[in-house]
């Protein structure tokens, strides 16, 4: 018996608008109906929780109103989008999946997605 497997892309480049999207896929050992997904960021030996959502299978993924994350779920796959990113937010973003109900509880952690964020160059002043 091993930890639940969670897959996510190794690298993602955020858009010029500071938006990064990636898929978090988990191999569910059972028929979970309630799943909790948490995005963690590891950088400079610090770990912070970026966002978290609990959802019922087949229902929409709902983050808190002030969350920088949005997402959708489809089967054992979660499509995550993080917005408002700046260069200083570059780091390893880890997908943590917990199968909350029904028992037994399972925990899986992905190997992390390195998100690179490059601040856009300011537009040069125009003479026109």
């Amino acid at each position: 018996c091993k930890a639940m497997h969670v897959a996510q892309p190794a690298v993602v480049l955020a858009s010029s608008r500071g938006i990064a999207s990636f898929v978090c896929e988990y191999a569910s050992p059972g028929k979970a109906t309630e799943v909790r997904v948490t995005v963690l960021r590891q950088a400079d030996s610090q770990v912070t929780e970026v966002c978290a959502a609990t959802y019922m299978m087949g229902n929409e993924l709902t983050f808190l109103d002030d969350s920088i994350c949005t997402g959708t779920s489809s089967g054992n796959q979660v499509n995550l989008t993080i917005q408002g990113l700046r260069a200083m937010d570059t780091g390893l973003y880890i997908c943590k999946v917990e199968l909350m109900y029904p028992p037994p509880y399972y925990l899986g952690i992905g190997n992390g997605t390195q998100i690179y964020v490059i601040d856009p160059e300011p537009c040069p002043d125009s003479d026109f």
Epitope: V47, L92, I94
Partner: nanobody
């Protein structure tokens, strides 16, 4: 699936010792980091120590006093607590995290990575 059960809490005088045990069933401990955490009344849950196959890590407040070890044959992790102080009084929890290649000595004990939390055992240090 992993199931953890901890034991060994109790009342001890300052300067005394206690040993906590965290026994796993349903899985071998091998692919997991096992951590000990504690929570005092009105405070956040904090890291005490953790151990994987090859490394251990401790909170600064317990270094030199507490020792974490694992016995794979018994599928059990131990926390030997010596020179106990009043400030060590708390509910102690055992938890597990899948061991990951990106864990560092500084992050492998971070509570965000853990699950399979036990109910907790009370440790009280008082004369």
């Amino acid at each position: 699936e992993v199931q953890l059960v901890e034991s060994g809490g109790g009342l001890v005088q300052p300067g005394g010792s206690l040993r906590l045990s965290c026994a796993a069933s349903g899985s071998t401990l091998d692919p997991f980091v096992i951590g000990w955490f504690r929570q005092a009344p009105g405070k956040e849950r904090e890291t005490v120590a953790c151990i994987n196959r090859s490394r251990t890590s401790y909170a600064d407040s317990v270094k030199g006093r507490f020792t974490i070890s694992r016995d794979n044959s018994k599928n059990t992790v131990y926390l030997q607590m010596n020179s106990l102080r009043a400030e060590d009084t708390a509910v102690y929890y055992c938890a597990a995290s899948p061991d990951k290649p990106f864990y560092t000595d500084q992050t492998m004990c971070n509570k965000h990575y853990y699950g399979y939390w036990t109910q907790g055992t009370q440790v009280t240090v008082s004369s």
